[in-house]
Amino acid sequence: PRSIDVKYIGVKSAYVSYDVQKRTIYLNITNTLNITNNNYYSVEVENITAQVQFAKTVIGKARLNNITHIGPLDMKQIDYTVPTVIAEEMSYMYDFCTLISIKVHNIVLMMQVTVTTTYFGHSEQISQERYQYVDCGRNTTYQLGQSEYLNVLQPQQ
């Protein structure tokens, strides 16, 4: 069998809302993946599991099941949304995200995604992780790749 390639493209959109009572930020982050099937037979994309981390804390998780099948030598672009919550011990971020003196409230999030594909009863998992900028101060639609956080700026693993 040939490879199945998973490429995390980036954040497509981030929609923000606030709970002023709880000083909590809700971010619905839609991401884009390209999945390429380099085989001469179809494969099923069985599920996608994703999580988002802020400051090493998981702030959101999502799982999509029975997503699609990809034909031989074909590629599909898949969008998936992860609802995230920045609250409790991170409520100090509410100050930053709602401060109107700042016009772009970029925070760095780590996007992790695992794609499970199946073919002929065989299962394969491919994982990717990427640091991305997301504006927590307003609803934003990104050009693909626009929100990428440069490798040189990544904290020590």
Epitope: V20, Q21, R23, Y94, D95, T98, I100, R138
Partner: antibody, heavy 119, light 111 residues
């Protein structure tokens, strides 16, 4: 109904100090940034200070930086402006206002409290 | 600092007719995020300023749709389609692209 009520304005000598207060009601005070704006005798408006919702960040123009300190008490729903080294050009009607994080505007203003700096 | 410039007085208008108030900024208020950080406030006699327009063209809550605003990055116009007696006051434009600055205010004059 959003209400902002300023107090503490007075006649003070140049070089003196004064603390203004702003009592907020009708909204979740701890969820909003707040600002002070002043209106000079010639009716010009000048922004004086901004504080974030939890008090973590404060922002000032150069004209008051180092002389004015903005703070807040989210338990008492009260905003403060500590003014020191006052000058005659600080004479104004001082308003507090709520910062709205959706419109990026100061959307509600109090009625103001008067500060006069004169020998 | 960004300087906001307004005429001190409007052309006198008759009740029921339209009025325009202009404002100019010393620098474009259009941010790279696509938002223009221009605001209009009205101060009625004996009252504190009230928000009319935010982000150049959006009507604040409770403001009648007789009010509208448009502009480029540096030149802005507030329009009142049918002036009423309650519209009398001083109109201030303001920006917060950078730290807040206000225009000197334009007094709406009624004939």
């Amino acid at each position: 109904e959003v209400q902002l009520v300023e107090s503490g304005g007075d006649l003070v000598k140049p070089g003196g100090s004064l603390r203004l207060s702003c009592a907020a009601s009708g909204f979740t005070f701890s969820g909003y940034g707040m600002s002070w704006i002043r209106q000079t005798p010639d009716k010009r408006l000048e922004w004086v200070a901004t504080i974030s919702s939890g008090g973590r960040y404060t922002v000032y123009p150069d004209s008051v930086k180092g002389r004015f300190t903005m703070s807040r008490d989210n338990v008492k729903n009260t905003l403060y402006l500590q003014m020191s080294s006052l000058k005659s050009e600080d004479t104004a009607l001082y308003y507090c206002a709520r910062d709205n994080f959706y419109s990026y505007a100061m959307d509600y203003w109090g009625l103001g409290t008067s500060v006069t700096v004169s020998a | 600092d960004i300087v906001m410039t307004q005429a001190a007085f409007s052309n006198p208008v008759t009740l029921g007719t339209s009025a325009s108030i202009s404002c100019r900024s010393s620098k474009s208020l259009l941010h790279s995020n696509g938002i223009t950080y221009l605001f209009w406030y009205l101060q009625k006699p004996g009252q504190s300023p009230q928000l009319l327009i935010y982000q150049m063209s959006n009507l604040a809550s409770g403001v009648p749709d007789r009010f509208s605003s448009s502009g480029s990055g540096t030149d802005f116009t507030l329009r009142i389609s049918r002036v009423e007696a309650e519209d009398v006051g001083v109109y201030y434009c303001a920006q917060n692209l950078e730290l807040w600055t206000f225009g000197g205010g334009t007094k709406l004059e009624i004939k």
